[in-house]
């Protein structure tokens, strides 16, 4: 994400088009309180961060309110008056959507439709991952809206599901972050379960007459 400038590595995360977090890792300045200066308009004066993140007692990042912005963040990380990293970035290219809310499951025979509240902005993928104890890895299906139908399930098996949201790479690029996963929920025969057995129970032997 952020290449080195005087040994400074930066990371930007734009949480759900609400809050921007810029963090830095500067080995050369590891015991220094670097300051963060920013503006959203190239013609304005820089403001200094009022909400610093601290690591081992020294500044390591800044949190900014940036509600529903699709503009450029101009920023400068400084050691006193000396800029050690200066850049401007389109914030949306560092989007991390919020975790899916109001996840619901609607069962119909060997299929389940997973729905949740769509986020207020677009160009997202809603991904459902699922597995049974018989599966060696998670299966995945994704759609452009939070309405994902998974077919071909075995009604007798217990399945674990979780959901997340991803920014479409074609639009937002490779520097975004998927949302955190929703809580895992387990289902069997259309009913919610506390958990799925980690190891599948072997089939009961048929008793010979």
């Amino acid at each position: 994400q952020g290449g080195a400038a005087e040994g400074v590595q930066i990371q930007i995360i734009y949480f759900n088009l609400e809050t921007v977090q810029v963090t830095w890792n500067a080995s050369k300045y590891s015991r220094t309180n670097l300051t963060f200066h920013y503006r959203f308009n190239g013609d304005e004066a820089y403001d200094q961060c009022t909400n610093y993140l601290l690591q081992e007692g020294h500044t390591s990042g800044c949190l900014l309110d940036a509600e529903q912005r699709d503009d450029i963040l101009y920023f400068s990380i400084r050691n006193g008056t000396h800029p050690v990293f200066t850049a401007s970035r389109w914030m949306v290219y560092y989007l991390k959507p919020s975790s899916p809310k109001h996840v619901r499951f609607s069962w119909h025979q060997d299929a389940v439709t997973v729905t949740c509240s769509d986020l207020s902005y677009g160009d997202l993928l809603y991904e459902v991952q699922y597995r049974s104890p018989f599966d060696t890895e998670w299966q995945s299906k994704q759609e452009n809206t939070c309405n994902v139908t998974i077919e071909g399930l075995d009604a007798e098996k217990c399945y674990s599901f979780w959901v997340r949201v991803k920014a479409m790479e074609d639009v937002y690029g490779p520097d975004t972050y998927p949302s955190d996963w929703s809580e895992v929920t387990c289902w069997q025969r259309g009913e919610i379960r506390d958990a799925c057995a980690e190891t599948p129970t072997p089939p009961k032997p048929k008793l010979s007459k």
């Epitope: 952020g2 290449g3 080195a4 400038a5 850049a87 401007s88 389109w90 160009d123």
Partner: antibody, heavy 118, light 107 residues
Framework: EVQLLESGGNLVQPGGSLRLSCAAS????????MTWGRQAPGKGLEWVST????????YYADSVKGRFTISRDNSKNTLYLQMNSLRAEDTAVYYC????WGKGFDIWGQGTMVTVSS | DIQLTQSPSFLSASVGDRVTITCRAS??????LAWYQQKPGKAPKLLIY???TLQSGVPSRFSGSGSGTEFTLTISSLQPEDFATYYC?????????FGGGTKVEIK
Amino acid sequence: EVQLLESGGNLVQPGGSLRLSCAASGFTFGSYVMTWGRQAPGKGLEWVSTISASGGSTYYADSVKGRFTISRDNSKNTLYLQMNSLRAEDTAVYYCAKDKWGKGFDIWGQGTMVTVSS
Amino acid sequence: DIQLTQSPSFLSASVGDRVTITCRASQGISSYLAWYQQKPGKAPKLLIYAASTLQSGVPSRFSGSGSGTEFTLTISSLQPEDFATYYCQQLNSYPPTFGGGTKVEIK
């Protein structure tokens, strides 16, 4: 096919106005940052203006600030550049371009020629 | 504004030659550098972005390297269709700025 097609270039007198259009096709226009650039005859490339995907944020080169206005109509898949108080030094081929994640301009139109002369 | 200095500004080479063009930035720009090819009367074409990532559809004989202030575009084996003008562009800090160009001509 992803395509940008500029129009509106012409011969105009100093102090005059012109409106350039850029019609986009083959991609979801309203999802992308868009840019105007230009190239004076025999010279290099120069960035002119950029607009965010929603149209809510605009950026201009110092040389055109206060004279040029970039805008877009996402329902018509069209980008515009309104050019006022034109000067001889604005004579150039004007290109519209699509932004690639803030790391380059990956699709360019064929260009439209603007000549400012009396 | 960040200045980009390209060198050489003019280059004479033969088909099959290995060609290297340099772009120097007046201050650190991380890896926010793009390279374009432009032929006479045509629009620029993106070759490389993020200093070293090849744009889809661009032949693999083109490569980019560098970070910070010094960058290079290399054409491993020059082809007849590669004779053109090449520009670097920084996008680390607005306004985006271009280098002055390098014209590659046939020897």
